[in-house]
């Protein structure tokens, strides 16, 4: 099946201190390689979460990514702060013959708006 990375929400709004879910699904797990979430684009993009076992504070996977047929790579960001605002991209990589892996497809991006916490 042809690989497609889908981020269904163009944008989400979340109050500071709350949690938000950023959705991402794939149509295929092939070619093998990791899935990572970034904020921003280009050289300055920031790695937010990687489905490769590392620990990321405040960010967790939503579904059980250890399922061998898992195609849901959505993440939950907890205790959101104004600094978390920006556009988040779910990116599929193909394993490389050497570092780094090759980016092969990205979702369309989900913009996160952080609202001031109601007083």
């Amino acid at each position: 099946k042809e690989l497609k990375v889908t981020q269904p929400e163009k944008s989400v709004s979340v109050a500071a201190g709350d949690s938000t879910v950023l959705n991402c699904t794939l149509t295929s797990l092939l070619p093998v390689g990791p899935i990572k979430w970034y904020r921003g684009v280009g050289q300055s993009r920031l790695l937010i979460y990687s489905f490769t076992g590392e620990h990321f504070p405040r960010v967790t996977n939503v579904s059980d990514a250890t399922k061998r047929n898992n195609m849901d790579f959505s993440i939950r960001i907890s205790n959101v702060t104004p600094e978390d605002a920006g556009t988040y991209y779910c990116v599929k990589f193909q394993k490389g013959p050497s570092e780094p892996d090759t980016e092969i497809q990205s979702g369309g991006g989900t913009e996160v708006y952080v609202l001031a916490k109601p007083s």
Epitope: L30, T52, G53, D64, S98
Partner: antibody, heavy 118, light 107 residues
Framework: DVQLVESGGGVVRPGESLRLSCAAS????????MSWVRQAPGKGLEWLAG????????YYIDSVKGRFTISRDNPKNSLYLQMSSLTAEDTAVYYC???????????WGLGTLVTVSS | ALTQPASVSANPGETVKITCSGG??????YAWYQQKSPGSAPVTVI????KRPSDIPSRFSGSASGSAATLIITGVRVEDEAVYYC???????????FGAGTTLTVL
């Protein structure tokens, strides 16, 4: 330190059943997929079954499907392999192994010996 | 099935390469497992083609390209004598497989 300790091996007769256990410590067991691998005397390694971190999804090699069942109890940090209709060909050292994110293995137990003999 | 040589030998200090073929680069990740005696616990020396666990000496390295993976031991030592198993995970079939093992003898 990651530690995996298998138990439950022993000598059984052909056709009988056995349940192996693997006690895990030193890591967040509920976050990792796990597998069982065996090694028959004088032979190589053979993967048998795997289970997702939450326990809802299981995977088997064709030769043990329907006879072996992998399961886990996350609150008890334990992995199990229920084996039935055992034959002499099931004689082996059985290892539990922790899976990496891409379903290879990073840590192994010391193994437990199962002998099927009449 | 994954195919690897039955045996290799080397003198201490030499570089050893063990190859493993039969996987599909598009769908397979490779690992290498060291077993020092039959029935003893295997030790993972390389996973994810080229990732070395933190407690494994830096003389062990791995690579993969095409349909083959390679384990490289640079400056082999007597204590590296063991059987080395190539392992693979196939993302197409969701199945793990192993090669038959390569016996490394350090002369």
């Amino acid at each position: 330190d990651v530690q995996l300790v298998e138990s439950g091996g022993g000598v059984v007769r052909p056709g009988e059943s056995l349940r192996l256990s693997c006690a895990a410590s030193g890591f967040t067991f509920s976050s990792y997929a796990m597998s069982w691998v065996r090694q028959a005397p004088g032979k190589g390694l053979e993967w048998l079954a795997g289970i997702s971190a939450g326990g809802s999804d299981t995977y088997y090699i064709d030769s043990v499907k329907g006879r072996f069942t992998i399961s886990r109890d996350n609150p008890k940090n334990s992995l199990y392999l229920q084996m039935s209709s055992l034959t002499a060909e099931d004689t082996a050292v059985y290892y539990c192994a922790r899976e990496t994110w891409n379903h290879l293995f990073d840590y192994w137990g010391l193994g437990t010996l199962v002998t099927v003999s009449s | 099935a994954l195919t690897q040589p039955a045996s290799v030998s080397a003198n201490p200090g030499e570089t050893v390469k063990i190859t493993c073929s039969g996987g599909d680069y598009y769908s397979t990740y490779y690992a290498w497992y060291q077993q020092k005696s039959p029935g003893s616990a295997p030790v993972t020396v390389i996973h994810s083609d080229d990732k070395r666990p933190s407690d494994i000496p830096s003389r062990f390295s791995g690579s993969a390209s095409g349909s083959a993976a390679t384990l490289i031991i640079t400056g082999v030592r007597v204590e590296d004598e063991a059987v080395y198993y190539c392992g693979g995970y196939d993302g197409r079939t969701y199945i793990n497989t192993f090669g038959a093992g390569t016996t490394l003898t350090v002369l």
